[in-house]
């Protein structure tokens, strides 16, 4: 079953006389989404070699994964606050129908899969409350979503273990740079 | 107490690969959060980070190195390895494998502080 | 991409107080608390002094102090002690997931 936020030793909730701030909150959210992604990724690289392959052979996988990169002013070089949490909110609104494709990838953790997705959603709607510049955030497309997982789907056995092996890296990766970005805010 | 051993041959030739070993004693390195670096030191010279394994197994390289080098791990054997390829007189030095976690290294994917290290083990490129 | 600047020597008397220095940039020192210290006697590995800029790790004297401005992070020992002579340094986490460490700085114990 899904850990909840604060049950983990490495997540010490704070005293119930301090009421988390919205910025705790989503700083522990993000904690417990990265919790959630290292579980999945166990029982993936119980089932496949795919945690042996090399992040080149990876990339080879034409997926569009969202990634930090210096324009979005997310690296402390060139920190724009704004800037950054659309980059943050865009990049995980694209994540979500990666998210929709790894739930049925795991047959042990199908739970976490779950929780993981959910809690993203919540993070979305936390982060939108914090970000005044809505009007920059571009929701993907449905359509296009939906002809993606189609795609993914589709996939053979390898591909799409490949395929979860990645998202899950990617998501990992993005999280943590959203993390060290929204601890300068 | 968590204890850290480098092993591996003391002189490699140039162009060839050096490998080396690090077993984990006192501790599992399969631990949650808890990353595992290699850092070198050349004689009479600084420290140079080289590359860290994290909890899920995610490889992280110093940029200059990349091309060269190879960090893998063996849980069942509380072993992480590093192959340098195509190794020239100027990799002469002593390697340090340590391990790096602390506070919210983990979520933050900050490995630079390394709280355990080996004793080091001294690698000679020379034909 | 070159390290994190350190003077290579500084000195003092058992009993005083010296800083060493530790210059980065926006991309590494600059970016949070990401900054730890190591002490390394001659012939042994380092040691883990300082983290989080600040935080002395597991069994370390309150003697040695961290702290950030800015760009430049700095390690501070009082009450000098002739055991505290060896080489110091900073290190730091750079974007994308890398480290770099300073050149080092010899502490010299007078007297």
């Known amino acids: 079953a899904p850990v909840l936020p604060g049950e983990d030793s490495k997540d010490v909730a704070a005293p119930h006389s301090q009421p988390l701030t919205s910025s705790e909150r989503i700083d522990k959210h993000i904690r417990y989404i990265l919790d959630g992604i290292s579980a999945l990724r166990k029982e993936t690289c119980n089932r496949s070699n795919m945690c042996e392959s090399s992040k080149e052979a990876l990339a080879e996988n034409n997926l569009n994964l969202p990634k930090m990169a210096e324009k979005d002013g997310c690296f402390q070089s060139g920190f724009n606050e704004d800037t950054c949490l659309v980059k943050i909110i865009t990049g995980l609104l694209e994540f979500e129908v990666y998210l929709e494709y790894l739930q049925n990838r795991f047959e042990s953790s199908e739970e976490q899969a779950r929780a993981v997705q959910m809690s993203t959603k919540v993070l979305i709607q936390f982060l939108q409350k914090k970000a005044k510049n809505l009007d920059a955030i571009t929701t993907p497309e449905p359509t296009t979503n939906a002809s993606l997982l189609t795609k993914l789907q589709a996939q053979n056995q390898w591909l799409q273990d490949m395929t979860t092996h990645l998202i899950l890296r990617s998501f990992k990766e993005f999280l943590q740079s959203s993390l060290r970005a929204l601890r300068q805010m | 107490e968590v204890q850290l051993q480098e092993s591996g041959p003391g002189l490699v030739k140039p162009s060839q690969t050096l490998s080396l070993t690090c077993t984990v004693s006192g501790g599992s390195i399969a631990t949650s959060y808890y990353a595992w670096s290699w850092i070198r030191q050349p004689p009479g010279k600084g420290l140079e980070w080289m590359g860290v394994i994290d909890y899920d197994g995610d490889t992280y390289y110093k940029p200059s190195l990349k091309s060269r080098t190879s960090i893998s791990r063996d849980t069942s054997k509380n072993q992480f390895s590093l192959q340098l390829s195509s190794v020239t007189p100027e990799d002469t030095a002593v390697y340090y494998c340590a391990r790096a976690g602390l506070g919210d290294s983990y979520y933050l994917g900050t490995y630079y502080a390394m709280d355990y290290w080996g004793k080091g083990t001294l690698v000679t490129v020379s034909s | 991409q070159a390290g994190l600047t350190q003077p290579p020597s500084v000195s003092g008397s058992p009993g005083k107080t010296v800083t060493i220095s530790c210059a980065g940039t926006?991309?590494?020192?600059?970016?949070?608390?990401?900054v730890s210290w190591y002490q390394q006697l001659p012939g042994m590995a380092p040691k883990l002094l300082i983290y989080?800029?600040?935080k002395r790790a597991s069994g370390i004297a309150d003697r040695f102090s961290g702290s950030k401005s800015g760009n430049t992070a700095s390690l501070t020992i009082s009450g000098l002690q002739s055991e505290d002579e060896a080489d110091y340094y900073c290190?730091?986490?750079?974007?994308?997931?890398?480290?770099?460490f300073g050149g080092g700085t010899h502490l010299t114990v007078l007297g």
């Open positions: 926006t991309s590494d020192v600059g970016t949070g608390n990401f």
């Open positions: 290190a730091s986490y750079r974007s994308l997931n890398n480290v770099v």
């Open positions: 989080d800029v600040n």
